[in-house]
């Protein structure tokens, strides 16, 4: 796959993942009422990160926001924080990656700058995806713990009126938002990895070495460390070339950076 295609695909995949992270964060169905014991419920409860909702058979749906911060479980606060961090990093990653795209020309930005930006955006996407996956997983773990605690309470003696009156304990299970979040986080992560791979293709691998000029007797040719390849412009062409610091590009070099095979 070409560098441009890899970078472009990574960007698109990350963008889809990022949109999914936003969608998951906003969704109300992070946890939904477990209908195993009562599949024909007339009142259906579901909860999100920001509000809890009740949908009745009548069609009436009521949602109430969590207007308190202090009264909320620390785990829920942590999940909220992780999702927001994921979104913020994703926004920055998108902005950086737009400028890093090889297919977009912005002023005199050279490939090494684009490579650095591609790597930066890739890392941001990876962290964004990880934040989302961790956030969703923490919430899922919280649900599993509460589910089994509710189940234990449900079967440990029904109190009141000598066991005659049953108290229906509402248990919650995984909501659609969790699956959206996992998939979205995974896509953002994959997109970020692809951006990092694309960065390797954009980076001149010999740019870390200083070019050294050797003055051969009888010839005034500057040599770069490396084999003689037609693609390097050496061998048949013996015109004087001024080597810049870092040896990334020659004065009249029209092509992009040497490939990673340009050194021995």
């Amino acid at each position: 796959m070409s560098v441009t295609a890899c970078q472009g695909l990574g960007f698109v995949v990350s963008l889809i993942g990022f949109a999914g992270i936003i969608a998951a964060t906003c969704m109300d169905q992070w946890s939904t009422q477990d209908l195993y014991n009562n599949p024909v419920t007339a009142v259906f409860n579901y909860q999100g990160l920001w509000r809890s909702c009740v949908r009745e058979s009548s069609g009436f749906t009521e949602c109430r926001g969590y207007f308190t911060l202090l009264g909320l479980p620390a785990m829920l606060q942590a999940v909220r924080a992780l999702m927001i961090v994921g979104i913020v990093l994703g926004v920055i990653g998108i902005l950086v990656s737009i400028f890093a795209l090889k297919c977009i020309r912005i002023g005199s930005m050279d490939d090494s700058a684009k490579a650095k930006m591609t790597l930066t955006s890739g890392i941001l996407f990876i962290i964004s995806g990880i934040c989302a996956i961790i956030g969703v997983s923490v919430f899922a773990n919280m649900l599993v713990t509460n589910f089994w605690m509710s189940t234990a309470n449900m079967y440990s003696g029904m109190g009141g009126m000598g066991g005659m009156v049953q108290t229906v304990q509402t248990r919650y299970t995984f909501g659609a938002a969790l699956f959206v979040g996992w998939v979205a986080g995974g896509l953002t992560l994959i997109g970020g990895v692809m951006m990092c791979i694309a960065c390797r293709g954009l980076t001149p691998d010999d740019s870390n070495f200083k070019a050294v000029s050797y003055h051969a007797s009888g010839q005034n040719v500057a040599y770069r460390p490396g084999g003689f390849k037609a693609s390097t412009g050496f061998g048949s062409n013996t015109r004087n070339k001024k080597i810049y610091d870092g040896g990334a590009r020659t004065e009249d070099d029209e092509q992009s950076h040497p490939t990673k095979y340009d050194y021995v």
């Epitope: 419920t41 007339a42 009142v43 409860n45 579901y46 909702c53 009548s58 069609g59 009521e62 229906v168």
Partner: antibody, heavy 118, light 113 residues
Framework: DVKLVESGGGLVKPGGSLKLSCAAS????????MSWVRQTPEKRLEWVAT????????YYPDSVKGRFTISRDNAKNTLYLQMSSLKSEDTAMYYC???????????WGQGTSVAVSS | DIVMTQSPSSLTVTTGEKVTMSCKSS????????????LSWYQQIPGQPPKLLFY???TRESGVPDRFTGSGSGTDFTLTISNVQAEDLAVYYC?????????FGAGTKLELR
Amino acid sequence: DVKLVESGGGLVKPGGSLKLSCAASGFTFSSYTMSWVRQTPEKRLEWVATIIIGGSYTYYPDSVKGRFTISRDNAKNTLYLQMSSLKSEDTAMYYCTRLVKGNAMDYWGQGTSVAVSS
Amino acid sequence: DIVMTQSPSSLTVTTGEKVTMSCKSSQSLLNSGNQKNYLSWYQQIPGQPPKLLFYWASTRESGVPDRFTGSGSGTDFTLTISNVQAEDLAVYYCQNDYSYPFTFGAGTKLELR
């Protein structure tokens, strides 16, 4: 003004069938969950069936499940109750009702009488 | 199924009196999601269909006089008529709106002494 008018009741033999209709007016019929409730000669109220707004979900008590079918025609603003394999215990006044907040029934029709007797 | 038990089955009152009738459910009708009790009260005047008085146990339906009060939570509910009028003589039913099958109480008949 909300109006629910039931029709289709009558005398039927055990094992027979009957189809009740409920013509709704004065409200957006398609936006409401509808139910049928019956009142026995002993004046006991029994819920018979519920059909959710879109018509995709229907609910019945065990006493009528498999014998009664609730349906709706939103274009005609009409609710139906198809009753088959009728038993003497199905003898009652059948009311068409509209569900609102709290799953409560805010409007009831005047009812249609069904008598199952040999 | 949730069983609704109403008591007393009949009440004999004089106009102006305060009346209280009870409704008990075999399961809690309190929904943890919105902290609302899914119980409704109906009034049936002879020869007429039932009329909704309260939903969510205590939310008064529009047009219902404020002498009627619905209260209670969980499994125990009460309908109170503070100043009984002649037009209040009817049968009062409570209903479980929380889970299918929806079930009604046997009713409390309010009669004039």
